[in-house]
């Protein structure tokens, strides 16, 4: 028997904001003619389900967002590689929990300069997950303890910080006609998740009075 990692390796889910993409790599023996077929299943189920649109493909990724859409469920996926010469290898992922494993993207924020303040409005983050009534769930609806951390760099030594669950924030007491750097991150304490920051560089308006 051959070493299967010669043909196929690093089969794993890459998940961000509940978009769940299966990725893998060809091993050193992988050839351009190698084709890949993907199956998935839930925890404890006997049968693997072939993913339509990801059978005998040559690319090294497959979007399983719809098939893994129950974020309280545990899933597996596996890839079968068949080389041009007829060699085969099958590899499966570890148990995948979207709640546990998905990473958070930077939030979508609008930064509005005023004369002596900067307003920051965080927009709800949509996900590909549908609620029972058919609407798309937002991150805020999935993670009830989701919070935002907003920081405003005033100068090299001074930073203003706000934190909360609400969508609208305002930093007051700023100097007019001055540029500030704002960073906004989203975090979920219970799941030890924190996004990379959204960054906005804004200049307060000049004081016309």
């Amino acid at each position: 028997p051959e070493d299967l990692s010669d043909l196929l390796q690093n089969v794993k889910f890459q998940s961000s904001n509940f978009e769940n993409i299966l990725t893998w790599e060809s091993g050193p023996e992988g050839t351009p003619g190698t084709v890949y077929s993907i199956e998935y299943k839930t925890y404890g189920e006997r049968d693997w389900v072939a993913k339509k649109g990801c059978q005998r493909i040559t690319r090294k990724s497959c979007n399983l967002t719809v098939e893994t859409g129950n974020f309280t469920e545990l899933y597996y996926a596996r890839v079968t590689a068949v080389s041009a010469g007829g060699r085969t290898a099958t590899k499966m992922t570890d148990r995948f929990s979207a709640l546990q494993h998905t990473t958070l993207k930077p939030p979508d924020v609008t930064c509005i300069p005023k004369v002596r303040s900067i307003q920051m409005i965080v927009h709800p983050t949509p996900t590909p997950i549908r609620a029972g009534d058919g609407h798309w769930l937002t991150l805020e609806e999935i993670f009830h303890d989701l919070s935002y951390r907003l920081e405003l760099q005033v100068n090299r030594t001074y930073q203003m910080r706000l934190e909360g669950k609400q969508r609208e924030y305002e930093f007051f007491g700023l100097t007019p006609d001055t540029e500030f750097l704002g960073t906004i991150t989203v975090f979920v304490t219970t799941w030890f998740k924190e996004s990379a920051p959204y960054v906005c560089r804004v200049k307060t308006l000049p004081d016309r009075t």
Partner: antibody, heavy 116, light 113 residues
């Protein structure tokens, strides 16, 4: 046809080590999880731990963590149970069993006797 | 750890009669994702490995005779052999796969009366 065959059991002195093998045939070992379960003479079943043979990720029953190690050689289609610091109470038939939740295929078992 | 307790420890049943084995878990085995119960039943004959009979508390494994059935939910489960045959003499185990470590009941020995 799926088959699991354990080997490597035998008599070992207290404090000794033993490595059990589980040779899988009829399927690729990397296609499903593999478990080790033991049964002391005349007693019930005890789950030792599992491995995802594709990734090497293991989960152990806390009772065995540190003394027992599960591994896989993909090229041999074989799983292993390395047992260290063996004690008399480790005397049992050791089974490998396939699947990730309950166990659909079992080997015939290999007897490990720990005695001086 | 979830403790699985079977009753009785042994039972003797006449050929063709019903055999009922109970299994109680120390916490609910209802898996919220699919509203199924994470419980399996095995049969073990002397000198043989266990054989899977039932999973998800009531799903019969392929090839298992339909006289074997599983029922129950939450913490209380039952394996029923509707008409005991001579070849059903064995020890029967329940197993939970709700959480690590997976645990088994102590076993119930079924004999012919």
């Amino acid at each position: 046809e799926v088959q699991l065959v354990e080997s490597g059991g035998g008599l070992v002195q207290p404090g000794g080590s033993l490595r059990l093998s589980c040779a899988a045939s009829g399927y690729s070992i990397t296609a499903e999880y593999m478990n080790w379960v033991r049964q002391a003479p005349g007693k019930g079943l005890e789950w030792i731990g599992e491995i995802n043979p594709s990734t090497g990720t293991t989960t152990y029953n806390q009772k065995f963590k540190g003394r027992f190690t599960i591994s896989v050689d993909q090229s041999k289609n074989t799983a292993y149970l390395q047992m260290n610091s063996l004690r008399a109470e480790d005397t049992a038939v050791y089974y490998c069993a396939r699947f990730d939740a309950y166990f659909d295929y079992w080997g015939q078992g290999t007897l490990v006797t720990v005695s001086s | 750890d979830i403790v699985m307790t079977q009753s009785p420890d042994s039972l003797a049943v006449s050929l063709g009669e019903r055999a009922t084995i109970n299994c109680k878990s120390s916490q609910s085995l209802l898996y919220s994702s699919n509203q199924k119960n994470t419980l399996a039943w095995y049969q073990q004959k002397p000198g043989q490995p266990p054989k899977l009979l039932i999973y998800w508390a009531s799903s019969r494994e392929s090839g298992v005779p339909d006289r074997f059935s599983g029922s129950g939910s939450g913490t209380d489960f039952t394996l029923t052999i509707s008409s005991l045959q001579a070849e059903d003499v064995a020890v029967y185990y329940c197993q939970q796969y709700y959480s690590y470590p997976f645990t088994f009941g102590q076993g119930t020995k079924v004999e012919i009366k």
